[in-house]
């Protein structure tokens, strides 16, 4: 799976699509995850209603909402008041029984608030790495992953 | 009327390949996943994998994992099973089924082929 | 690999009486992920239940199916002559779907 980048503004709300194959994925609940380092587990932010035929309502998890179109077959997450901690590599995810199919992997980037003068010091964006596989960019603001760029902040 | 049918009888060599058929009609054959099901003789089912013809997304058991290779077509709406050098151990009845559209995402398969008998023999 | 093992392995009943068969699951399964299915000799499997306890279209009503985690049951109320066949449980939790051996019900 390619990478798709979404960059939001420290402060206001970001949505995140994720389309898919609305018959291939029928009847499947969906799920958002954040990935825990470059090969650890994602774990679940946020799902949609137990109920499939529920899933366009939208359920919130903290700061965090999905609502599934499930004729349409999109996907849509959003951070509310985003975070510069919202920022890291997420993926989209269709759920049946214990297993989960990845949709698409999504890398969030906090931009500072520019009418916010405070130090932005603490926002994070990715780094250079030649080892980072080809990424996809679609705009939201969003775009995909550059050719040689990490989806996880370095490591001390 | 939704059915599978599948290519007929066949009787091979070992080490000769095949390739065997399912032909979907009556219904949208790319929107559903056909799972293939395999019977040896006087023996239960089991499951050998399964593909999405919208997209060949595939998914085999690691019984049948490199022993065989799950295919479609959907221009015209067929899947297939092949073998490229066949064992006496495959001689079995093979199945495609269609895996229904349910709430909740089960793969309940809820249309079969008749099935297609292979003998493996020298 | 999720392992089903059903038993018994036959079932010797008269028509007119109640079948109960069973199918246990090595792993839980989750959110009922298991189906039923009936074969008779020379035929292909017939869908009779999905996720545990849904009867799949055009199945009579005596089919019933209950269960969950690793504990699942295919209840016929009262056998018809039609009945008396091979069935088999899958669990569509976890790649690979796996079958159970099956239960032969065969008449008394």
């Known amino acids: 799976h390619n990478t798709t980048v979404f960059q939001g503004v420290a402060g206001q709300s970001l949505q995140v699509s994720c389309p898919y194959d609305s018959m291939k994925h029928w009847g499947r609940r969906k799920a958002w995850c954040r990935q825990l380092g470059e090969k650890g587990p994602c774990q679940r932010v946020v799902s949609t209603h137990n109920l499939w035929l529920l899933s366009f309502l939208r359920r919130w998890n903290g700061s965090t909402a999905i609502t599934d179109d499930t004729l349409g077959g999109t996907l849509t997450i959003t951070l509310r008041n985003l975070q510069p901690h919202d920022a890291g590599l997420y993926q989209c995810q269709s759920l049946h029984g214990s297993e989960a199919d990845t949709l698409r992997k999504v890398l969030v980037e906090v931009l500072a608030d520019p009418l916010d003068h405070r130090d932005a010091g603490d926002l994070w964006f990715p780094g250079e790495s030649e080892s980072f596989e080809d990424a996809h960019v679609e705009h939201s603001i969003s775009r995909s992953l550059l050719e040689g760029e990490i989806p996880f902040p370095p490591t001390s | 009327e939704v059915q599978l049918v599948q290519s007929g009888a066949e009787v091979k060599k070992p080490g000769e390949s095949l390739k065997i058929s399912c032909k979907g009609s009556g219904y949208s054959f790319t929107t559903y996943w056909i799972g293939w099901v395999r019977q040896m003789p006087g023996k239960g089912l089991e499951w050998m994998g399964i593909?999405?013809?919208?997209?060949?997304?595939?998914r085999y058991s690691p019984s049948f994992q490199g022993q065989v290779t799950i295919s479609a077509d959907k221009s015209i709406s067929t899947a297939y099973l092949q073998w490229s050098s066949l064992k006496a151990s495959d001689t079995a009845m093979y199945y495609c089924a269609r895996a229904g559209h349910y709430d909740g995402g089960h793969l309940g398969m809820d249309v079969w082929g008749q099935g297609t008998t292979v003998t493996v023999s020298s | 690999e999720i392992v089903m093992t059903q038993s018994p392995g036959t079932l010797s009943l008269s028509p007119g009486e109640r079948a109960t068969l069973s199918c246990r699951a090595s792993?839980?399964?989750?959110?009922?992920?298991l189906a039923w299915y009936q074969q008779k000799p020379g035929q292909a499997p017939r869908l009779l239940i999905y996720g545990a306890s849904s009867r799949a279209t055009g199945i009579p009503d005596r089919f019933s199916g209950s269960g969950s985690g690793t504990d699942f049951t295919l209840t016929i109320s009262r056998l018809e002559p039609e009945d008396f066949a091979v069935y088999y449980c899958q669990q569509d939790d976890r790649s690979p779907y796996t079958f159970g051996g099956g239960t032969k019900v065969e008449i008394k």
């Open positions: 593909i999405y013809p919208g997209d060949s997304d595939t």
């Open positions: 792993q839980s399964v989750s959110s009922s992920y």
